[in-house]
């Protein structure tokens, strides 16, 4: 006996209950493929997510996280609060980071600043909670009658700090 | 049929005190830690405050000291008991499930209730 399911259609299911029919998918769920015996529940976005595709007959619901959040995990399967930069997320919530890290984005950990003087270079500009440091010539390229190549960088202007 | 239910909220004086409840039906809540979040107009959503199924407690630094979360096993119930209140601490207040265990992170299948007001006005 043939089965009848195959030629069911995405966005149908095949219904054993009337004779392998193919019926349509009942409101709130979904097949993506063909042959179905069952319609799959859509996925809803509630709380901290957001719909950023609505579910069809044929395909599931697309969740985003609301603002002050960012999707972790495929399909954005957990919504993540943001942070400032220069601070990262811990079991109290947002906290700054320590001397001596940093974090540029509004997620992740703090992370520590570059040691310049593993690459034997010295500090041009210190580091801040924001940023990590930014590492300039090696200390003997700076010296008196040291020749360089390449001029070093000018100088940056008091009471200007990197954005 | 999960369900979450929210209710206690309301208008109350600057350094006044509240107590919300939150019902919670359909799943095994003895097993299950719990959040409270919020929502100030024009903000964005906070989280609150958390209480994993032992009772360990989580709060955010701005309620810590004002804020107590707990639970009742025996009555499927979480409350936010809310003292010293702020007008800053006006806003739709949240009860859900907490299934990812990590502060300010939320998973798909949690569930969520619907909210209930919570105003701090002289």
């Known amino acids: 006996l043939q089965d009848l399911c195959s030629n069911c259609p995405a966005g149908t299911f095949c219904d054993n209950n009337r004779s392998q029919i193919c019926s349509p998918c009942p409101p709130n769920s979904f097949s993506s493929a063909g042959g179905q015996r069952t319609c799959d529940i859509c996925r809803q976005c509630k709380g901290v997510f957001k719909t950023r595709k609505e579910c069809s007959s044929t395909s599931n619901a697309e969740c985003d996280c609301i603002s002050g959040y960012h999707c972790l995990g495929a399909e954005c399967s957990m919504c993540e609060q943001d942070c400032k930069q220069g601070q990262e997320l811990t079991k109290k919530g947002c906290k700054d980071c320590c001397f001596g890290t940093f974090n540029d984005q509004k997620r992740g950990i703090c992370r520590p600043w570059t040691n310049c003087s593993l690459d034997g270079k010295s500090v041009l500009v210190n580091g801040t909670k924001e940023r990590d440091v930014v590492c300039g010539p090696s200390p003997a390229d700076l010296s008196p009658g040291a020749s360089s190549a390449t001029p070093p960088a000018p100088a940056r202007e008091p009471g200007h700090s990197p954005q | 049929e999960v369900d979450l239910v929210e209710s206690g909220g309301g208008l109350v004086q600057p350094g006044g005190s509240l107590r919300l409840s939150c019902a919670v039906s359909?799943?095994?809540?003895?097993?299950?830690?719990m959040s409270w979040a919020r929502q100030a107009p024009g903000k964005e959503f906070e989280w609150v405050s958390s209480i994993y199924s032992d009772g360990k407690t989580y709060y955010v630094d701005s309620v810590k000291g004002r804020f107590t979360i707990s639970r009742d096993n025996a009555k499927n119930t979480v409350y936010l008991q809310m003292s010293s209140l702020k007008p800053e601490d006006t806003a739709v207040y949240y009860c859900?499930?907490?299934?990812?265990?990590?502060?300010?992170?939320?998973?798909?299948?949690?569930?969520w209730g619907q909210g209930t007001q919570v105003t701090v006005s002289s």
């Open positions: 859900a499930t907490w299934k990812t265990l990590r502060v300010g992170v939320w998973d798909e299948s949690d569930y």
């Open positions: 359909g799943f095994t809540f003895s097993n299950s830690a």
